[in-house]
């Protein structure tokens, strides 16, 4: 599941990892666009073992993974992409 969140929080990620996470271990990926107090785009991977990892958006593997998830989600109903506007 790919989620895009627009939050009023500041940066959520203190430290970023770039270590490849196989798709079978990923529960969902949360994308926090830059802005609203955080100057950078953040990508948060929620793993199936309940752990959470912030991933460097420059890492090619996460870009390719998101691309595949977008492709899969666009052919699935309901579309599992959620957008939250700032209240």
């Amino acid at each position: 599941v790919l989620e895009v969140y627009y939050t009023s929080l500041r940066c959520r990620c203190v430290q970023e990892s770039s270590v490849f996470i196989p798709r079978r271990f990923i529960d969902r990926i949360q994308i926090l666009p830059r802005g609203n107090g955080c100057p950078r785009k953040e990508i948060i991977v929620w793993k199936k073992n309940k752990s959470i990892v912030c991933v460097d958006p420059q890492a090619e593997w996460i870009q390719r993974m998101m691309e595949v998830l977008r492709k899969r989600s666009s052919s699935t109903l309901p579309v599992p992409v959620f957008k939250r506007k700032i209240p």
Partner: antibody, heavy 120, light 107 residues
């Protein structure tokens, strides 16, 4: 058997254009990123550009971005490299290669290479 | 961009020897490193990706290791057919970049 076959290169004048093609067979073309890499005789490898599964995402070597265009025709299983305003520094052997997907990385199959000479 | 440096342009070895080819990245590439072999007159061939994953069909005498900025390709017992150029490449972030290459010569 995975096969990548590049079109004939050749001799071109500085400032002119040339379009290379690479015909893929033996695998599901749309499952892979594709890339172009070049090699100046007796020199190292230089990555040129790559393209995603459906052509919606392309990446280039910064210095070539304004002159080279990578594209693909998934109906025909062909990868292209359109090169314009060619310079003598573009003289090289150009290879097309399969460039992995979302879980596999590395260029695992390469074409035989095609030689491009830019000279007056 | 990430710069990869292969400090040895040439390495001389004998059949049966163990040899290690090194590659240093200008920044942490988080094990996103591939190794290629290019024999004279041939196209490059993938040996290793993700720093240590051997590509299908690659003999087990080839081993990749490393993390952070330092990576090594080791050939445990060099064979005559291993005479070739060896390149490292980072697949962490585009533009993909290659090391300058190390030419393995057999004594």
């Amino acid at each position: 058997e995975v096969k990548l076959v590049e079109s004939e290169g050749g001799l071109v004048q500085p400032g002119s254009s040339m379009k290379l093609s690479c015909t893929a067979s033996g695998f599901t073309f749309t499952d892979y990123y594709m890339t172009w890499v070049r090699q100046v005789p007796e020199k190292g490898l230089e990555w040129v550009a790559n393209i995603n599964y459906d052509g919606s995402r392309t990446n280039y070597l910064d210095s070539l971005k304004s002159r080279f265009i990578i594209s693909r025709d998934n109906a025909k299983n062909i990868l292209y490299l359109q090169m314009s305003s060619l310079k003598s520094e573009d003289t090289a052997t150009y290879y097309c290669a399969r460039d992995g997907n979302y879980h596999f990385y590395g260029m695992d199959y390469w074409g035989q290479g095609t030689s491009v000479t830019v000279s007056s | 961009d990430f710069v990869l440096t292969q400090s040895h342009k040439f390495m001389s070895t004998s059949v049966g020897d163990r040899v290690s080819i090194t590659c240093k990245a200008s920044q942490d590439v988080s094990t996103a490193v591939a190794w290629y072999q290019q024999k004279p007159g041939q196209s490059p061939q993938l040996l290793i990706y993700w720093a240590s994953t051997r590509h299908t069909g690659v003999p087990d005498r080839f081993t990749g290791s490393g993390s952070g900025t330092d990576y090594t390709l080791t050939i445990s017992s060099v064979q005559a057919e291993d005479l070739a150029l060896y390149y490292c490449q980072q697949h962490y972030s585009t533009p993909w970049t290659f090391g300058g290459g190390t030419k393995l010569e057999i004594k």
